[in-house]
């Protein structure tokens, strides 16, 4: 695994086939997860930020920005979107929470909580995914369209098996996360496929 | 195997330093996370710190943060901890441990290092 | 910090015995604990990680349970190199902290 501290992955065109494979042994149906990472971006149409599939299931998990300031997150191919006002193009802070006990799903964006959301009440999200940065799966680990991929760049990524609490999510907003237990992006196990290139973090 | 060897028994004055190394062989040392641990006489564990190798960043423990150095030379793969202002209460054998590969536990420990203060 | 509570501190048993020690953490550290062996004059072994997951090569008698600040660790049935000191560790939160640990002996 690699310490990316201070680095991000940058996609630096529209394409069907640049993307980068995160690896987890995640070994047990998710309950519950807290996604943060920061991203930077200057596309206005909609893009995958995280796509995360299972064998046979398509948008098992993905975090999707339909258009500037609505960020949707998919669950078990179901949706809830959620509205924020924000510059564009800007960098961003990004952590997604959702319950199944509850079906509450929360975006925090730049340490600012949105408005809860409720989907997939007691749906377990399955284990051993594929999870892909850059392409939104239409398979497992494949079947990319361009029109939905990103381009721009993304770093400081973690993924914790629980709902983190206020305080905890502006932890890693303000970069200092706890150790992390799904994703880690100090302990990242990862592939890059196509032209997808480590650089350090300038914009935070 | 996945091996970490570290230097022998040292005894140190109060008020000194002490560096203790540990060197891996076996695995990629550029890709895992070391740990120190220290153990005091009869006593529990306690968390020192970490480095990542390649990129060289560390996290301490706030208790070691203004005495512990956690250093590595990846020319010879070989991880440090130096401890400075040694007082008797830091007698104890000291550890380095790998992180796991995919989460923060050590799966592999070295034989242990005991460092004695006393004047 | 959080601090991880063994109980109990020492524990006596004989081979055949079903043991069972509990660790407790001072706040939830969700599924983020592992069980150690440790051996006098050796370094620790890990036994459990993630709460409930067997490390390669542990025998299946020893396994793990508990989620949020409760945990557990069970021998099913002791045998003669079971007998050492037992520590939890939780790895939810900086800085990374150990229960004191319980030392099962030879009844």
């Known amino acids: 695994h690699t310490d990316l501290s201070g680095k991000v992955f940058v996609f630096p065109r529209e394409s069907v086939t640049d993307h980068v494979n995160l690896i987890t042994p995640l070994e047990k149906p998710l309950q519950n997860f807290t996604l943060c990472f920061r991203a930077y971006s200057d596309l206005s149409r909609a893009y995958s930020l995280f796509s995360y599939n299972t064998q046979g299931r398509d948008n098992e998990l993905l975090v999707y920005k339909e258009r500037v300031g609505e960020y949707s997150l998919y669950i078990g191919r179901h949706k809830v979107t959620s509205k924020v006002i924000e510059k564009f193009p800007a960098p961003v802070h990004i952590c997604v929470s959702w319950e199944s006990s509850s079906g509450i799903a929360e975006f925090w964006i730049n340490g600012t909580p949105l408005v809860k959301k409720g989907l997939r009440q007691g749906y377990f999200v399955e284990a051993q995914p594929k999870i892909v940065l850059g392409q939104e799966q239409d398979s497992y680990g494949g079947k990319f369209d361009r029109s939905q991929s990103f381009v721009g760049e993304i770093g400081d990524l973690y993924m914790w098996d629980s709902v983190l609490p206020p305080e905890n999510i502006l932890s890693a907003y303000q970069g200092t996360p706890l150790p992390a237990n799904i994703l880690d992006w100090q302990a990242l196990n990862y592939e890059i496929r196509g032209y997808v290139i480590i650089k350090p973090l300038v914009w935070v | 195997q996945v091996q970490l060897v570290q230097s022998g028994a040292e005894v140190k004055k109060p008020g000194s330093s002490v560096k203790v190394s540990c060197k891996a062989s076996g695995y990629t040392f550029t890709s895992y996370w070391m740990h120190w641990v220290r153990q005091a006489p009869g006593q529990g564990l306690e968390w020192i710190g970490m480095?990542?190798?390649?990129?060289?960043?560390?996290n301490y423990n706030e208790k070691f943060k203004s005495r512990a150095t956690i250093t590595a030379d990846k020319s010879t793969s070989t991880a440090y901890m130096e401890l400075s202002s040694l007082r008797s209460e830091d007698t104890a054998v000291y550890y380095c441990a790998r992180r796991n590969d995919y989460y923060w536990y050590f799966d592999v420990w070295g034989q242990g290092t005991l460092v004695t203060v006393s004047s | 910090d959080i601090q991880m509570t063994q109980s109990p501190s020492s524990l006596s048993a004989s081979v055949g015995d079903r043991v069972t020690i509990t660790c407790k953490a001072s706040q939830n550290v969700n599924s983020n604990v592992a069980w150690y062996q440790q051996k006098p004059g050796k370094a620790p072994k890990l036994l459990i990680y993630s709460a409930s997951y067997r490390y390669s090569g542990v025998p299946s008698r020893f396994s793990g349970s508990g989620s949020g600040t409760d945990f557990t660790l069970t021998i099913s049935s002791l045998q003669p190199e079971d007998f050492a000191t037992y520590y939890c560790q939780q790895c939810n939160n900086y800085p990374f902290t150990f229960g004191q640990g319980t030392k099962l002996e030879i009844k």
């Open positions: 480095i990542h190798p390649n990129s060289v960043n560390t």
